[in-house]
């Protein structure tokens, strides 16, 4: 969390941003809030990116003002216009690109004053893994698949019964480049699994950490997955 203040004494407002990550090819949110104003026409929102000459986005007098918008963001940005009045200056970024990563500034002017805060935006690819029993294999085998990751993640297997065990000798992980030549499909196979145990396939890069769990008993198979973005800090 980054909290910024205006620097002109009493004419300062608090602006708060949260570091976040974008999944390339999907839409992302750059979060920013500020002390609200009662009059929409008095609010100016500017989004800037370090190393980019034009503006990322500008909203003033109740509408977008895109005459100075940088070409790399053309047609890809929007604020939540109906939420500006309550202090939400967050930016929606469509079709996130790897090159969108960097440091952004949310700059606000209201009738109370001005303020700004920076945020770090990371970009990459991350997806939920799915763990299944591989019935085609000669021995009891689990297969963990996740369709889109970038940068290349690490994959670690764990088990509830054999806590702390190292499964690297009995697992095999491969990374297959997807058709857009950036993201990769992750496939990891775990051999010699035992029944009545819960196994976890953990995939992690510097942007996200995802886990796929599978519990195999004689009567049923239970699966669970979750994904967590790393380094979401407020400013």
């Amino acid at each position: 969390l980054i909290i910024g203040f205006g620097i002109s004494g009493r004419h300062s407002i608090t602006v708060t941003t949260v570091a976040s990550a974008g999944n390339i090819g999907e839409d992302g949110i750059l979060s920013c809030t500020f002390e609200p104003d009662i009059k929409l026409s008095d609010i100016v929102i500017q989004w800037l990116k370090e190393g980019v000459l034009g503006l990322v986005h500008e909203f003033k007098e109740g509408k977008d003002e895109l005459s100075e918008q940088d070409e790399m963001f053309r047609g890809r940005t929007a604020v939540f216009a109906d939420q500006v009045i309550v202090g939400n200056a967050s930016l929606r970024l469509k079709n996130v690109q790897l090159t969108d990563a960097g440091t952004y500034k949310c700059y606000i002017i209201t009738s109370k004053g001005k303020g700004n805060a920076n945020l770090e935006y990371k970009t990459g690819a991350f997806s939920m893994p799915e763990v299944n029993v591989d019935y085609n294999a000669s021995s009891e085998t689990l297969r963990c698949e996740a369709p889109r990751w970038f940068p290349q993640p690490t994959v670690v297997w764990a088990s509830q019964v054999d806590q702390g065990a190292n499964f690297s000798e009995v697992s095999n992980t491969s990374f297959e480049l997807n058709s857009e030549n950036v993201t990769m499909k992750v496939v990891s196979v775990l051999y010699n699994v035992t029944i009545n145990n819960t196994y976890s396939c953990m995939i992690e890069n510097d942007i996200a950490k995802a886990t796929g769990d599978i519990k195999v008993t004689e009567s049923e198979i239970k699966r669970r997955s979750h994904l967590q973005l790393l380094n979401s800090k407020a400013s």
């Epitope: 500017q46 800037l48 990116k49 190393g51 980019v52 000459l53 503006l55 500034k105 700059y107």
Partner: nanobody, 122 residues
Framework: EVQLVESGGGLVQPGGSLRLSCAAS????????MHWARQVPGKGRVWISR????????SYADSVKGRFTISRDNAKNMVYLQMNNLRAEDTAVYYC???????????????WGQGTTVTVSS
Amino acid sequence: EVQLVESGGGLVQPGGSLRLSCAASGFAFSNYWMHWARQVPGKGRVWISRISGDGRSTSYADSVKGRFTISRDNAKNMVYLQMNNLRAEDTAVYYCARDRFGDDYYYGMNVWGQGTTVTVSS
């Protein structure tokens, strides 16, 4: 106050070279990315190149890649654009600009120099 003064423009034949210079003052020069952009009469400014504060990171518009080189001298508060193999379509007013991103940014801040004219003609 941010001040940027460009120089080095002129008339050059196709295939020729020019080196543009930009003298910066009024801000902590080495903390900022610097840019070059150009404008053809009747059209908007078009970004062509940028360089990071430490000079280690550069990038270029496709139209000038391989022909133009941006550089900087932080000791002298100068940024340069070396233009080789110039073409008629490079004819424009060339502007030096400071990155907006910084603690001193304010709404309506002028980050542009006054421009220098480059004419490529035989």
